[in-house]
């Protein structure tokens, strides 16, 4: 949320859109006449990356000078200034900062506590005054039975044989975000949530280790949902619907085991958890949870540097990384991403000033803060400049947590980036086994949806900007994230080949940047959404009979999907027929491509009430998965199915898809209006 200072002091994003060549980067004597080709650029990038010591930078960013660096703290700010200075040293076209005043939640001087009490509320004993906390928890005291709900997924709650209403729920960390666990528990009228790391999933020797997280089912400052708090907008006080109304607290494994000692019932064997795990507190005992966290307003800084494009400076790819971290552990969470951001910025600055690389489009390097509170810095920037970013920012590349292991290369992205990612995976070799990252022609089916706790999520789901996040990681979660053990030493112990792994991540990101800013035709595969739409229609088709019973038809949805398919085919034909050297024509065609993601944002919901408007990847009743979930209820439990809602969902989903098809078609006279 942003407070606007005097105008002359405020650097607006729009300034990055100027084309004044005097502001572009200084270059040494480099041949400017010949355009570098993809093969040359790839080799150039690879050579540049070979000469960089990534691990040293990560180590430097993980040391006491910059830790701990909670958002808005002095050390967070000093790192921000360091990054800003680095960007200046790289002689970027423009370097600027974005200042926001956001509400974050911190621990109070009064300790949070977990206590076992008897049925009369009398103290049996103190289990723990936890060292960690969960930001945006409700500050409250609750007492009740404790029920284990595994990871706290919707299915986990469905599989329980005991209701959780009026009870405190204990869940394992992992699988889904803290916020989702809490939202699932709250939806079933649980009164509080405890989260712990079991030894099976998080093999940490220290059972007393505390950890941090946040419980906002959303991103950005939850007290300015869907909008930035510019002081002249005069929005009344507001509160995100994603904030929990129940207290939530992280506890150590040792505390969880103390609780299990007062509990009964075997945890199911298919949970594959610790043998100490138990299901419910004994009938004579209750658990009392007290959370007394407090809200604080903090000034936060996002730092930006731009390399302006030489042909289309008003079109930009954004590359970003989280700078902050809750607690003392910073290495895997934010030092890797920030180090990578700095080194990529240096490499690209170098390629332009020394080697003649001339990106057509601009590259914005962004250092976000308050990421640990739910991508606050990134979201506030998006909220503040939503209209400026539309049809300008065309891809976001997230560098957070890119190296957590070596075994797997995992991708989460907009379908528009699948084809490009596939090509890059074929090009880039894994540093350990020397084989290409492309292991499986079926890799797209393994792509995981971007989650709420990923900074790429608001780009895609809130702003409709194609986004990608990737990581080298293990099947198991990296155990130290959110703990004080997230140190450089722990990371190098887990990933001995850290330097090579980060270098490879840099190669993936670097190739993405080059392909997206260099090629005349925008490397976004709009045809990928055909299979997404087909998959949705197939899922819906299973319920043909139900839809017919309601007197509804899928004909219009088929028609909208068909129009989208025809529009993509027509655009492909147009690209094929276009003269690649005709910049004007190519820009018009690329603009049509840039509309695709944005037009999957439902125009029928308010960004304030439902900020994540994307019908595929967003959150809320307007999404296609929500439509299917609602329809499923008709078969399972007629009482829970909402027919009025479904009728709306189907009509609006159909028209959103039709709108996306129309936008892709181009001009209004090109649109097939038989609909």
């Amino acid at each position: 949320c942003k407070r606007v200072e005097q105008k002359e002091e405020c650097v607006k994003l729009a300034e990055t859109e100027e084309t004044d060549k005097s502001e572009t980067m200084e270059t040494e004597d480099v041949p400017t006449s010949s355009r570098l080709y993809w093969a040359d650029l790839k080799t150039l990038l690879s050579e540049k990356l070979n000469s960089i010591e990534f691990a040293d930078t990560i180590k430097q960013l993980s040391q006491n000078t910059y830790t701990p660096r909670e958002a808005g703290s002095q050390k967070d700010e000093s790192l921000a200034y360091y990054i800003e200075n680095q960007f200046h040293e790289f002689k970027f076209s423009k370097v600027w900062r974005d200042e926001h005043y956001v509400k974050i939640q911190v621990k109070d001087s009064a300790q949070n506590s977990v206590i076992i009490v008897d049925k009369n509320g009398r103290l049996v004993y103190l289990v723990e005054n936890p060292g960690g906390y969960v930001a945006y928890s409700k500050a409250a005291t609750v007492t009740g039975k404790l029920v284990h709900a595994n990871f706290g997924t919707k299915k986990d709650f469905e599989d329980l044989y005991t209701p959780v209403n009026g009870s405190i729920v204990i869940v394992r960390a992992g699988k889904i975000t803290f916020a989702e666990k809490v939202a699932n528990a709250e939806s079933l009228n649980a009164i509080g949530v405890l989260i712990y790391m079991d030894q099976t999933k998080f093999p940490i020797v220290n059972a007393e280790l505390s950890f941090f997280g946040h419980a906002h089912l959303g991103t950005g400052d939850p007290y300015t949902p869907g909008f930035p708090s510019f002081n002249h907008t005069q929005f009344p006080p507001s509160r995100s619907s994603g904030l929990p109304n129940i207290p939530v607290q992280t506890i150590s494994r040792a505390a969880a085991e103390k609780l299990f000692g007062n509990m009964e019932g075997d945890c199911p064997s298919d949970w594959k958890t610790d043998s100490t795990c138990r299901m419910v507190t004994s009938e004579s005992k209750n658990v009392k949870l007290t959370v007394s966290n407090v809200l604080k307003e903090r000034r936060i800084l996002n730092i930006f540097g731009v390399i302006k494009g030489y042909e289309e400076p008003d079109r930009y790819v954004v590359v970003g990384a989280q700078r902050d971290a809750l607690g003392a552990g910073v290495a895997a969470k934010s030092s890797v991403g920030t180090g990578l951001l700095l080194k990529l910025a240096q490499v690209f600055s170098d390629m332009i000033s020394k080697d003649g690389f001339r990106p057509s489009r601009s590259i914005i390097f962004a250092s976000w803060t308050a990421g640990d509170f739910g991508a606050v810095g990134a979201t506030e920037w998006l909220e503040g400049y939503l209209s400026s970013l539309h049809l300008k920012a065309f891809t976001y590349i997230n560098l957070d947590k890119v190296v957590l292991g070596t075994s797997n290369f995992k991708v989460s992205a907009s379908p528009l980036l699948y084809t490009l990612m596939g090509k890059i995976m074929q090009d880039v070799k894994h540093p350990v086994d020397g084989k290409s990252l492309y292991r499986d022609s079926n890799w797209i089916s393994k792509v995981e949806k971007l989650s709420f706790d990923n900074a790429a999520y608001p780009f895609l789901a809130y702003s409709g900007i194609p986004a990608v996040s990737f990581c080298f990681c293990e099947d198991a979660d990296y155990p130290y994230l959110g703990t004080r053990l997230d140190t450089y030493e722990a990371l190098t112990q887990k990933v001995p080949q850290l330097n090579q792994m980060v270098r490879t991540a840099a190669e993936v990101a670097g190739q993405l940047i080059i392909k997206l800013t260099h090629d005349v035709e925008l490397n976004l595969d709009y045809e990928r959404y055909n299979s997404q739409l087909l998959s949705f229609v197939r899922d819906l088709n299973q319920y043909r009979a139900d839809i017919k019973e309601m007197g509804l038809s899928l004909q219009w949805l088929y028609s909208a999907r068909g129009d989208f398919f025809r529009a993509t085919s027509r655009l492909t034909t147009d690209f094929g027929n276009a003269e690649k050297t005709d910049r004007f024509v190519m820009k018009k065609l690329n603009d049509r491509v840039m509309r695709v993601e944005y037009h999957f944002l439902s125009p029928y919901v308010s960004p304030k009430e439902s900020p994540f408007r994307h019908v595929f990847w967003g959150s809320g009743s307007h999404t296609l998965p929500a439509l299917l979930e609602n329809l499923k209820l008709r078969k399972q439990n007629n009482g829970a199915f909402n027919e009025t809602l479904f009728r709306n969902q189907l009509a609006l989903a159909t028209w959103t898809i039709q709108g996306a098809a129309n936008a892709l078609s181009g001009d209004v006279w090109d649109i097939d209006n038989e609909f």
Epitope: E264, D266, P268, M279, S282, E283
Partner: antibody, heavy 122, light 109 residues
């Protein structure tokens, strides 16, 4: 309808063995602890053994410890009681019972079978 | 082990009368862990009260439980013909064994 049906009772000589089964239906068997309770002819109820929902924790009355083994097969919704080294004082009607609350082992028993008779006599 | 002693052994009453059955424990029992059962000849026991005072599903409100520590009571406010049976108390809160009282027979006077 929640139902428990015991089987396997009969006449056995002292020192002999017998295996009782209890088939459960109408509820989520794997979520509940189960118990065996017996009643000697003309006498009161005697708790024999209890087993937690996943089979991880078992408890026995002193009078049967080391001779009886309680077990369950959650995939078959069946509870078992393996009785070895039987004595004349083990003669009784054996009831299988379900705990009231899911997961609780320390719980009242809200559903009972009709019982199966075990007679130990030479 | 906790020994539960029920009194009286037999209670002779007429339909419509109030029945008060007592269960005394040899050591303190958490009220969360005391139950009462009814058993009729040739039938399995039936849960009436759990947690000392909570009525099980489908149990008429003429049955009520009370007490704490070592003294617990089952009260039948107005005896109906179908209430004549043997009543057992059970504790299930301590470490095993989980014991039953010897029973109180409520018979028609």
């Amino acid at each position: 309808e929640v139902q428990l049906v015991e089987s396997g009772g009969g006449l056995v000589q002292p020192g002999g063995s017998l295996s009782l089964s209890c088939a459960a239906s109408g509820f989520s068997f794997k979520g509940y602890s189960m118990s065996w309770v017996r009643q000697a002819p003309g006498k009161g109820l005697e708790w024999v053994s209890s087993l937690s929902n996943g089979g991880g924790s078992s408890y026995y009355a002193d009078s049967v410890k080391g001779r009886f083994t309680i077990s369950r097969d959650n995939s078959k919704n069946t509870l078992y009681l393996q009785m070895n080294s039987l004595r004349a004082e083990d003669t009784a009607v054996y009831y299988c019972a379900k705990t009231l609350g899911a997961y609780y082992i320390k719980s009242a028993m809200d559903v009972w079978g009709q019982g199966t008779t075990v007679t130990v006599s030479s | 082990e906790i020994v539960l002693t029920q009194s009286p052994g037999t209670l002779s009453l007429s339909p419509g009368e109030r029945a008060t059955l007592s269960c005394r424990a040899s050591q303190s029992v958490s009220s969360s862990y005391l139950a009462w059962y009814q058993q009729k000849p040739g039938q399995a026991p039936r849960l009436l009260i759990y947690g000392a005072s909570s009525r099980a599903t489908g149990i008429p409100d003429r049955f009520s439980g009370s007490g704490s520590g070592t003294d617990f009571t089952l009260t039948i406010s107005r005896l109906e013909p179908e209430d004549f049976a043997v009543y057992y108390c059970q504790q299930y809160g301590s470490s095993p064994p989980w014991t039953f009282g010897q029973g109180t027979k409520v018979e028609i006077k």
